[in-house]
């Protein structure tokens, strides 16, 4: 899988889209996970509704939401009130039993808010990811009106 880069701005919302073959993945729930290391675990952040027919309903975990257009074949993840520590390598997954197929690898890059005059060091949370060739950058930036979301904390 090539990796698609999505750029967002700290404090705003970032929408990530993962297209897939709706027939091939018919009946399958989807998930969004965070790659904690180059060859380490991909930790589940949020998954679609337990009932596949209700996959269109938005589900939240902290400041991250997921919704699935099962007919159109597009999984959409929203990272609300984006923070520097939300940067990283993620995967959109299609679940079947205990297995998971990767639909898309996503690198989220978080830029400091140019309108935020606080010291950038106070916003900062850097990090890194895995080798991916020919990354495609998608600018998906929209202003968030929601404040104070708690970021999803990694756990082993």
């Amino acid at each position: 899988h090539n990796t698609t880069v999505f750029q967002g701005v700290a404090g705003q919302s970032l929408q990530v889209s993962c297209p897939y073959d709706s027939m091939k993945h018919w009946g399958r729930r989807k998930a969004w996970c965070r790659q904690l290391g180059e060859k380490g675990p991909c930790q589940r952040v949020v998954s679609t509704h337990n009932l596949w027919l209700l996959s269109f309903l938005r589900r939240w975990n902290g400041s991250t939401a997921i919704t699935d257009d099962t007919l159109g074949g597009t999984l959409t993840i929203t990272l609300r009130n984006l923070q520097p520590h939300d940067a990283g390598l993620y995967q959109c997954q299609s679940l079947h039993g205990s297995e998971a197929d990767t639909l898309r690898k996503v690198l989220v890059e978080v830029l400091a808010d140019p309108l935020d005059h606080r010291d950038a060091g106070d916003l900062w949370f850097p990090g890194e990811s895995e080798s991916f060739e020919d990354a495609h950058v998608e600018h998906s930036i929209s202003r968030s009106l929601l404040e104070g979301e708690i970021p999803f904390p990694p756990t082993s």
Epitope: L36, E109, L111, W124, F125, G127, F132, E133, P154
Partner: antibody, heavy 119, light 107 residues
Framework: EVQLLESGGGLVQPGGSLRLSCAAS????????MAWVRQAPGKGLEWVSS????????YYADSVKGRFTISRDNSKNTLYLQMNSLRAEDTAVYYC????????????WGQGTLVTVSS | DIQMTQSPSSLSASVGDRVTMTCKAS??????LAWYQQKPGKAPKLLLY???NRFTGVPSRFSGSGSGTDFTLTISSVQPEDFATYYC?????????FGQGTKLELK
């Protein structure tokens, strides 16, 4: 194989300037956040500066803010650190490092380049 | 800023010994901790991230545990190449701060 090779270190007088370079290979450089970490002689590790994979945002430790500038040239797979108004306390081995995005740990390190600030 | 304090500052061990060293955070950092190994004149090497995940190529004798403010790095059976200085680092939230290091020496 991931390789990071620093250059540009040396002896400089207080108040002087120096530019460090780091040539990266073995990975897709433009898709990685990068950072500089330093280590004063006989001391521990100190994070100095970082920037995002596109170079769109840069960040600095309080101790170097306003004096150091981090940058990158993704077409040349090279990371830079421009150091101005150098002080004796900036004397250290400077390591070029690759970061794991959003986690802030450093998974690969260069061999380091020594910067000595002395009159 | 959160401070990371390592103890002991040095410890002596023989090949084959089981050794543990600790890292204490001044505030709760969850499991957001990394460990590095550094040998004299060399660059640090990543050992563990998020407390217990071994980095590529790190032998299974290295393990990490803890959460909140107290963390432990354990080497189950020390090998000759393990004599080095070990640093912990707070990760996931800025600023990036390291402990002062624990030097593992040959007894």
């Amino acid at each position: 194989e991931v390789q990071l090779l620093e250059s540009g270190g040396g002896l400089v007088q207080p108040g002087g300037s120096l530019r460090l370079s780091c040539a990266a290979s073995g990975f897709t450089f433009s898709n990685y956040y990068m950072a500089w970490v330093r280590q004063a002689p006989g001391k521990g590790l100190e994070w100095v500066s970082s920037l995002t994979n596109s170079g769109g945002s840069t960040y600095y430790a309080d101790s170097v803010k306003g004096r150091f500038t981090i940058s990158r040239d993704n077409s040349k797979n090279t990371l830079y650190l421009q150091m101005n108004s150098l002080r004796a306390e900036d004397t250290a081995v400077y390591y070029c490092t690759r970061e794991w995005a959003g986690s802030g740990y450093f998974d690969y390190w260069g061999q380091g380049t020594l910067v000595t600030v002395s009159s | 800023d959160i401070q990371m304090t390592q103890s002991p500052s040095s410890l002596s061990a023989s090949v084959g010994d089981r050794v543990t060293m600790t890292c204490k955070a001044s505030q709760n950092v969850g499991n957001n901790l990394a460990w590095y190994q550094q040998k004299p004149g060399k660059a640090p090497k990543l050992l563990l991230y998020y407390t217990s995940n071994r980095f590529t190529g790190v032998p299974s004798r290295f393990s990490g545990s803890g959460s909140g403010t107290d963390f432990t790095l354990t080497i189950s059976s020390v090998q000759p190449e393990d004599f080095a200085t070990y640093y912990c680092q707070r990760i996931y939230n800025s600023p990036w701060t390291f402990g002062q290091g624990t030097k593992l020496e040959l007894k």
